[in-house]
Amino acid sequence: EVEKTACPSGKKAREIDESLIFYKKWELEACVDAALLATQMDRVNAIPFTYEQLDVLKHKLDELYPQGYPESVIQHLGYLFLKMSPEDIRKWNVTSLETLKALLEVNKGHEMSPQVATLIDRFVKGRGQLDKDTLDTLTAFYPGYLCSLSPEELSSVPPSSIWAVRPQDLDTCDPRQLDVLYPKARLAFQNMNGSEYFVKIQSFLGGAPTEDLKALSQQNVSMDLATFMKLRTDAVLPLTVAEVQKLLGPHVEGLKAEERHRPVRDWILRQRQDDLDTLGLGLQGGIPNGYLVLDLSMQEALS
């Protein structure tokens, strides 16, 4: 190991204070006791250290805690957290939601970094599941957080946590993710009455199967076109013209503007033209009258 430079006379730090901003990097290394730093971490945030000085302070903590920092230090890292690598964070055991919040606050406004992703991963794994309080906290800081998880990770979300999810939290979710979240939402909201239930479940409907859409069509929900366009194509195709009309209510007129886009385009191709004509929207492309409709999916299943 390289021989360490001695601290100049009278420069030994008695406490972590603003006088340290005048210290050169080597002086900080030589004159600041790591244990003192650890006990006064909460003061560091108020002192305008340069990034280079912060590197020295981090190095001192790394030497003091080679197996990873204790939570008492982690909670007070402040902007020193921005200096941590994912490798550093993997050594931590963060159990307190307050610690998580403190570190996310430091990172507020920053892009979701590998450090933050690692921190969240460590925290959630430590808890065993993504509980409501954690999900509330994470989506408050990162609205897209839920949709950054894999379907496998989402499977650990308990239905009770779904109450914390806001519509904007699902904006970037793909169908595979909604397939996992929808049954949880259905379970979470099952005791609500019709209109209230629809308001809550609406954002999750991209994962709904045909039978649930059929059931909704009987409840005068008046689904808007934006929601309809996010439904699974395979769930929409079996719906009859009458069921779609009931499902959309007054919004049915919007089908005309979307007739070239999925799932509307594919749905039109499966309907009889005379059934489509009953809507009076001028939708074209249905099965001409007199044609026989074969269910090819049954044929594929047999072959």
Partner: antibody
Framework: QVQLVESGGGLVKPGGSLRLSCAAS????????MTWIRQAPGKCLEWISY????????YYADSVKGRFTISRDNAKNSLYLQMNSLRAEDTAVYYC??????????WGQGTLVTVSS | DIQMTQSPSSVSASVGDRVTITCRAS??????LAWYQQKPGKAPKLLIY???VLQSGVPSRFSGSGSGTDFTLTISSLQPEDFATYYC?????????FGCGTKVEIK
């Protein structure tokens, strides 16, 4: 001595794109955080983005979030700002600066970006 | 965001005068404050950081003081090359923000 030289500015139509570059010399570029700051004609200075030495930590001001992307190439001693969906209000002199956390100690001479139809 | 308010917006002074510029933060920033000098057509130049630390190479006639929300830049004896616009800037939190400048003009 420390030198920062911006390039890539010019006239662009609203909705257009530009990529600014900042060539650094005279210091170990990979050791330092870097920042972009702009100054609209006759207006205040506005800090718009920074990137950590490794490139893993990034921040954007709300005014440019989702439109601008900061990046760096430590092997080339270069900092970049990719600007998309440009608006008239993005017209400014753009400066790159070395970021020391508590201050910006060296600045480039600036490059003018004009967004106009 | 933290707002930085400089006053006055301009000041007329003569060579040899003592000039004081103030900067107020909308919330406490301890000593996270820097001062810059900018001349027309040039990039800003760092004068002082951490409220009172003089940047290397900057003449000692420049000094900074203050803590919390109120800060001062003082030029003890104005020199011809000091006629410029001065900006304060906070680094206490993101986004970093600047004051809108104080122009020091020749009387």
């Amino acid at each position: 001595q420390v030198q920062l030289v911006e390039s890539g500015g010019g006239l662009v139509k609203p909705g257009g794109s530009l990529r600014l570059s900042c060539a650094a010399s005279g210091f170990t570029f990979s050791d330092y955080y870097m920042t972009w700051i702009r100054q609209a004609p006759g207006k205040c200075l506005e800090w718009i983005s920074y990137i950590s030495s490794s490139g893993s930590t990034i921040y954007y001001a709300d005014s440019v979030k989702g439109r601008f992307t900061i990046s760096r190439d430590n092997a080339k001693n270069s900092l970049y700002l990719q600007m998309n969906s440009l608006r008239a209000e993005d017209t400014a002199v753009y400066y790159c600066a070395r970021d020391r956390n508590s201050h910006f100690d060296y600045w480039g001479q600036g490059t003018l970006v004009t967004v106009s139809s | 965001d933290i707002q930085m308010t400089q006053s006055p917006s301009s000041v007329s002074a003569s060579v040899g005068d003592r000039v004081t510029i103030t900067c107020r933060a909308s919330q406490g920033i301890t000593r996270w404050l820097a001062w810059y000098q900018q001349k027309p057509g040039k990039a800003p130049k760092l004068l002082i950081y951490a409220a009172s630390v003089l940047q290397s190479g900057v003449p000692s006639r420049f000094s900074g003081s203050g803590s919390g929300t109120d800060f001062t830049l003082t030029i003890s004896s104005l020199q011809p090359e000091d006629f410029a616009t001065y900006y304060c800037q906070q680094s206490n939190s993101f986004p970093r923000t600047f004051g809108c400048g104080t122009k020091v003009e020749i009387k």
